[in-house]
């Protein structure tokens, strides 16, 4: 019969003729034969394949650096890798997730918008009128001025995107 | 003809050791994967362990990793199974069974008849 | 630890097709084996790496695996294919039996 030009799925050609693919998990040991079937291996214990494949070695888990403030997120198995993220307080530098940062605080006259992940930054957003932050924060939302009308109090001092305003008596009408 | 055969079951008690033999003959031994699997009365098949052509890669199911030892001596055409620490839920028949000669890749092509291993007091 | 999930039973009438599956997480991205076992018998293999026969089993029986579920399919199934089936798999550094199909043929 005619050597094949194409194979299936799960197979690849070498020396004309179609040898089954190592599954996920699982390295090659030595190509098929006319005679004999592909040979494959499971990964070792901290090493993982996640396609089919004809490797002949499997890549090494992820290692998560606590020095770099790294933590495991998810345990690698033989066909995935190990998911690292960032220790509390911190997040990842990059979506390969190679380091951590700290978390940057939102300055006063700025409030948290969203707060940060192990994987994003805390996003701030200046205060709009109406609005206050009078502190440095990751966690911190602006927040509104007071009321002073529903204290039945009057405004003595008008707040601003980092202080909040200062309510006083009202002035008593003189007879 | 392709034969395996399976030798050195019987009743033990609980706590106790056997040591499972299996001859191979009829084919070249020391070019295939070979595991044991057992099977509960009235129960399915379960893997026991595995192991490599020539022994330096080994695989052991969890209910028995560090009671169980799967060798072989491919001069002597023979897989064994050391059985340490036995209890009554290793009660079962046990078979080695020949790899397709592909690693993790084949299915068990040739199986003996299975000896029978009882643990109770 | 990695689960194969056979259905307990199935039955067929003589010359008609029978499924048997097996079901598992991410089941398409390993090979499947297929084992028939008659009673007081040793398993044999009739099916291996998904599809393919070992020589000495009949054309009727043939495999497929895709996405979450194997099938083995024994068509013009006859009465001397009345016996237990196992479906088998590797996953990671162990290896995986269904837990048997006990295929009656009416």
């Known amino acids: 019969p005619e050597p094949p030009t194409a194979c299936r799925e799960k197979q690849y050609l070498i020396n004309s003729q179609c040898c089954s693919l190592c599954q996920p998990g699982q390295k090659l040991v030595s190509d098929c034969t006319e005679f004999t079937e592909t040979e494959c291996l499971p990964c070792g214990e901290s090493e993982f394949l996640d396609t089919w494949n004809r490797e002949t070695h499997c890549h090494q888990h992820k290692y998560c650096d606590p020095n770099l403030g790294l933590r495991v997120q998810q345990k690698g198995t033989s066909e995935t890798d190990t998911i690292c993220t960032c220790e509390e307080g911190w997040h990842c530098t990059s979506e390969a997730c190679e380091s951590c940062v700290l978390h940057r605080s939102c300055s006063p006259g700025f409030g948290v918008k969203q707060i940060a992940t192990g994987v994003s930054d805390t996003i701030c957003e200046p205060c709009p009128v109406g609005f206050f932050s009078n502190v440095s924060s990751a966690f911190e939302k602006c927040h509104p001025w007071t009321s002073c009308e529903t204290k039945d109090l009057v405004v003595q001092q008008a707040g601003t995107n980092k202080t909040d305003v200062v309510c006083g008596p009202q002035d008593r009408l003189r007879a | 003809q392709v034969q395996l055969v399976e030798s050195g079951g019987g009743l033990v008690k609980p706590g106790g050791s056997l040591r499972l033999s299996c001859a191979a003959s009829e084919f070249t031994f020391s070019d295939y994967y070979m595991s044991w699997i057992r099977q509960a009365p009235g129960k399915g098949l379960e893997w026991v362990s595995y192991i490599s052509r020539s022994g330096d890669t080994i695989y052991y199911a969890d209910s028995v990793k560090g009671r169980f030892t799967i060798s072989r001596d491919n001069a002597k055409n023979s897989l064994y199974l050391q059985m340490n620490g036995l209890r009554a839920e290793d009660t079962a028949v046990y078979y080695c069974?020949?790899?397709?000669?592909?690693?993790?890749?084949?299915?068990?092509?040739?199986w003996g008849q299975g000896t029978l291993v009882t643990v109770s007091s | 630890s990695y689960e194969l999930t056979q259905p307990p039973s199935v039955s067929v009438s003589p010359g008609q097709t029978a499924s048997i599956t097996c079901s598992g997480e991410?089941?398409?991205?390993?090979?499947i084996c297929w084992y028939q076992q008659k009673p007081g018998q040793s398993p044999v293999l009739v099916i291996y790496q998904d599809f393919k026969r070992p020589s000495g089993i009949p054309e009727r029986f043939s495999g497929s695996n895709s996405g979450i579920t194997a099938t083995l399919t024994i068509s013009g199934t006859q009465a001397m294919d009345e016996a237990d089936y196992y479906c088998q798999a590797w996953d990671s550094r162990t290896v995986v039996f269904g837990g048997g199909t006990k295929l009656t043929v009416l």
């Open positions: 991410r089941l398409g991205n390993k090979y």
């Open positions: 069974a020949r790899d397709l000669a592909a690693g993790a890749t084949g299915g068990l092509d040739c």
